[in-house]
C-alpha cells in the first residue's frame, strides 16, 4: 500500500495498537518478474527455476474469476466490440492456462508496457498467491524493474488486444474439459 515505503526486502518494526506491526516491502517495491517468453506448459520461468501451476486450487481461482476478475476485465474492455480482436493465444489445460494468463498479465510486451497495476491484474496476482502453493515466494524474489516503468496507466490498442486474449484464456480455464479447437 501507499503507507509502505521501505527499502526492498526489509521490514520495519513498530509498536502500536496494542498488537504488533511490522511494515513490509510494498507492492511498489516488489513488481513481478518479467520475461519475454511464450509458454506451452504449466511452467513459468522464475529466475533459475520454473513455477509449476499444477497444484493450484483451480476451483477457488475459478470462483474468484467468476465473481470479480471477469467483471474487471469487462470494465477494462468497455467501449470495445467483442469481435474487434481475434484470439491468437490458446491453452490446453488449467496449469497451462494459468501460465499463459500470468505471462500476459504481468510480462511487458511491445506496445503494452504493463497491465500489472490494473484491478484485474491485482486480483489475479492475489488469487495465484493465495491458491497456488509457493507462488507468493516467487513474487518476493521478483525483480524491481517494473517499479520505474509503472508510474501511470495508459490504455493502448495493444493493451486492449492483450486483455481480449486474457479473456479468452480465462474462458478456456473455466472449461477445462472442452477439447482444444
Amino acid at each position: 500500500g501507499l503507507n509502505d515505503i521501505f527499502e526492498a526486502q526489509k521490514i520495519e518494526w513498530h509498536e502500536g495498537g496494542g498488537g504488533s506491526e511490522q511494515k513490509l516491502i510494498s507492492e511498489e517495491d516488489l513488481g513481478s518478474s518479467h520475461h519475454h517468453h511464450h509458454h506451452s506448459s504449466g511452467l513459468v520461468p522464475r529466475g533459475s527455476h520454473m513455477y509449476d501451476f499444477t497444484n493450484c486450487d483451480f476451483e477457488k481461482i475459478k470462483a474468484a474469476y467468476l465473481s470479480t476478475i471477469s467483471k474487471d476485465l469487462i470494465t477494462y474492455m468497455s467501449g470495445t466490440k467483442s469481435t474487434e480482436f481475434n484470439n491468437t493465444v490458446s491453452c490446453s489445460n488449467r496449469p497451462h492456462c494459468l501460465t499463459e494468463i500470468q505471462s500476459l498479465t504481468f510480462n511487458p510486451t511491445a506496445g503494452c508496457a504493463s497491465l500489472a497495476k490494473e484491478m484485474f491484474a491485482m486480483k489475479t496476482k492475489a488469487a495465484l498467491a493465495i491458491w497456488c502453493p509457493g507462488y507468493s515466494e516467487t513474487q518476493i524474489n521478483a525483480t524491481q524493474a517494473m517499479k520505474k516503468a509503472r508510474k501511470s496507466k495508459v490504455t493502448t490498442n495493444k493493451c486492449l488486444e492483450q486483455v481480449s486474449q486474457l479473456q479468452g484464456l480465462w474462458r478456456r480455464f473455466n472449461r477445462p474439459l472442452l477439447k482444444q479447437q
Partner: antibody, heavy 120, light 107 residues
C-alpha cells in the same frame, strides 16, 4: 501507522456463538487479507482462516469449517470472526493478523488478541 | 496438511550464548517459512520471513536459513530480551500451520 484493534474479552456459554471484531487502520484494507489465529491456554498457534477483501472471499481451516465464519465490512475496514457451537476447548486468545496479497505475503501486523472464555 | 516439527521443545541457555532452533516440514515447502517470537501476554512478532529474509528493526543477531523441509533460526548471541517462545509458520499452502514452538529459557 498500522493498527489492528480487536474487541474486548468475552465470556460465553457452551453451545452459544461469539463474534470478534478487528478494526484496521493506517493502510489500504483491500491490499491485505485478514487472517485469524487462535491460541489455547499454554498451547501453540492455530490458523483458523482468512478473509480476502480484494476478492471478497474467505478460506478456512477444515477443522473450523461450518463453525467459523470470517467476514469483513470494507466500508469500516473491520474484519469479523464468528465461532458457533462453542465448547470449553474453544477457550483461547483469538488474534487477527494482516497479510499482503499482492506483496509481502506474510503476517506482519497482529491485533492485541481477544480472550474468549467458554464456561457453563 | 503440512506439519511443522520444531526442536528442541525447550532450549536452556545463558545470555551471550548462541541459540539454534530447528523447524522441519512434513513435505517440501521451498522457502515459505516464517519465524515469530512470542512473549507472555503478547501477540507474535515477525522476525524472519521466507526462510532467510531479514527485517529492518529486528536485531541482526537473528538470522534464518534452510529450504525444502529443513529450516533453522539462529540467535548469534542471546540477550536478556530474547528469552521467549519461537514459532515457525508455513505459508506454502492452506491450511497455514505453525510449529509447536521452542521455548528459549535462561539457564
Amino acid at each position: 501507522q498500522v493498527q489492528l484493534v480487536q474487541s474486548g474479552p468475552e465470556v460465553k456459554k457452551p453451545g452459544s456463538s461469539v463474534k470478534v471484531s478487528c478494526k484496521a487502520s493506517g493502510y489500504i484494507f483491500t491490499d491485505y487479507a485478514m487472517h485469524w489465529v487462535r491460541q489455547r491456554p499454554g498451547q501453540d498457534l492455530e490458523w483458523m482462516g482468512t478473509f480476502i477483501p480484494l476478492l471478497d472471499t474467505s478460506d478456512y481451516n477444515q477443522n473450523f469449517k461450518g463453525r467459523a465464519t470470517i467476514t469483513a465490512d470494507k466500508s469500516t475496514s473491520t474484519a469479523y470472526m464468528e465461532l458457533s457451537s462453542l465448547r470449553s476447548e474453544d477457550t483461547a486468545v483469538y488474534y487477527c493478523a494482516r497479510m499482503g496479497v499482492t506483496h509481502s505475503y506474510v503476517m506482519d501486523a497482529w491485533g492485541q488478541g481477544t480472550l474468549v472464555t467458554v464456561s457453563s | 496438511e503440512i506439519v511443522l516439527t520444531q526442536s528442541p521443545g525447550t532450549l536452556s541457555l545463558s545470555p551471550g550464548e548462541r541459540a539454534t532452533l530447528s523447524c522441519r516440514a512434513s513435505q517440501h515447502i521451498s522457502r515459505s517459512v516464517h519465524w515469530y517470537q512470542q512473549k507472555p501476554g503478547e501477540a507474535p512478532r515477525l522476525l524472519i520471513y521466507f526462510a532467510s529474509q531479514s527485517i529492518s528493526g529486528i536485531p541482526d543477531r537473528f538470522s534464518g536459513s534452510g529450504s525444502g523441509t529443513d529450516f533453522t533460526l539462529t540467535i548469534s548471541r542471546l540477550e536478556s530480551e530474547d528469552f521467549a517462545v519461537y514459532y515457525c509458520q508455513q505459508s506454502y499452502s492452506f491450511p497455514y500451520t505453525f510449529g509447536r514452538g521452542t521455548k528459549v529459557e535462561i539457564k
